[in-house]
């Protein structure tokens, strides 16, 4: 599947997942905490203040680095999966903290966590996610 299609599919799935998670957690616009979001790279579930959310590296990096081996499982497509099975010490895991001021920036930043190789990816722009 073309990466652009994967992207659109993942974004749509993310919005559905967030909606389901909001219902499960009883989240609404006035709830304290951090709303679920699609950050143009991957999907983040809603979280309570003080909660750290972990995600596996998104499909985007598997396209860039097909030989990259991550020690973590991919979060399930039907829901957000069990992020307890992920560990920040693993390669391929990104975290955000939910604070009183909202989401922190990703840690580590995606390129560091997911093994982005700018030289390996110089070619093949047709497989690049154009996020519009």
């Amino acid at each position: 599947m073309h990466s652009d299609c994967i992207f659109k599919k993942e974004q749509a799935m993310c919005l559905e997942k967030i909606q389901r998670a909001n219902e499960l957690m009883g989240f609404n616009d006035s709830s304290p905490g951090c709303p679920g979001m699609w950050d143009n790279i991957t999907c983040w579930k809603p979280a309570h203040v003080g909660e750290m959310v972990l995600v596996s590296c998104p499909e985007l990096f598997r396209i860039f680095n097909p030989d990259q081996v991550w020690e973590t499982e991919t979060i399930g497509e039907s829901d957000f999966g069990d992020s307890n099975s992920l560990d920040l010490s693993d390669m391929g895991v990104v975290s955000r903290n939910c604070t009183e001021d909202g989401w922190s920036e990703p840690f580590p930043h995606y390129f560091d966590a997911c093994g982005f190789d700018e030289y390996e990816s110089e070619t093949g722009d047709q497989d690049y996610y154009y996020l519009s």
Epitope: D39, N40, I41, N97, T99, D101, S104, E105, P106, F107, P108, H109, Y110, F111, D112, E118, S121, E122, Y128, Y130, L131, S132
Partner: antibody, heavy 120, light 107 residues
């Protein structure tokens, strides 16, 4: 090798506008976030703004929010900083820097800077 | 916004001595704290990322430690080319911020 060359600096009167440019080469510009960081004469570094690789996300320091606009043209490998309502305290050497990430990242490569002097 | 405080403002040492620079954040930044070196008339150079991760091309005498709110940059044995200004930078929360810098000068 990564190269960033800033231009557009100069002397401008308070209240006027100026647009800075940063020409990038030696890397796939369209895949990286980009930052502007400034340094007033004899002072420390001040983070100004960042733009995500596709221009979809832009963030600013409080001191410039509403006055400065960061933008990019990936087809020209160029980063911009539109500065309006300039003040004396905006006088600084403005650096563009590559952010090591799609979204924001930390600056890993820097240009040599372009000097902006706001004076009547 | 997160305020970064660096101490001391100036550190006067001789070549061969050990330099210990401190950076303190007003709230936790986890490990998203990076160190830069700037020499007069030059652009800053990234030295250490994520508090303690070394970078290729950076001499092994530079090391970093810390997490949360307290961080340290250590230069194990100062070389003449190490006399410069050092800045910490947090990329944990927007707006990003830099510390005011520590100047390491020759005693």
């Amino acid at each position: 090798q990564v190269q960033l060359v800033e231009s557009g600096g100069g002397v401008v009167q308070p209240g006027r506008s100026l647009r800075l440019s940063c020409a990038a080469s030696g890397f796939t510009f369209s895949r990286f976030a980009m930052h502007w960081v400034r340094q007033a004469p004899g002072k420390g570094l001040e983070w100004v703004a960042v733009i995500s690789y596709d221009g979809g996300n832009k963030y600013y320091a409080r001191s410039v929010k509403g006055r400065f606009t960061i933008s990019r043209d990936n087809s020209k490998n160029t980063l911009y900083l539109q500065m309006n309502s300039l003040r004396a305290e905006d006088t600084a050497l403005f650096y563009c820097a590559r952010g090591y990430d799609f979204l924001t990242g930390y600056p890993d490569y820097w240009g040599q800077g372009t000097l902006v002097t706001v004076s009547s | 916004e997160i305020v970064l405080t660096q101490s001391p403002a100036t550190l006067s040492l001789s070549p061969g001595e050990r330099a210990t620079l401190s950076c303190r954040a007003s709230q936790s930044v986890g490990r998203s704290l990076h160190w830069y070196q700037q020499k007069p008339g030059q652009a800053p150079r990234l030295l250490i990322k994520y508090a303690s991760q070394s970078l290729s091309g950076i001499p092994a005498r530079f090391s970093g430690s810390g997490s949360g709110t307290d961080f340290t940059l250590t230069i194990s044995s100062l070389e003449p080319e190490d006399f410069a200004v050092y800045y910490c930078h947090q990329s944990s929360r927007l707006p990003f911020t830099f510390g005011p810098g520590t100047k390491v000068d020759i005693k």
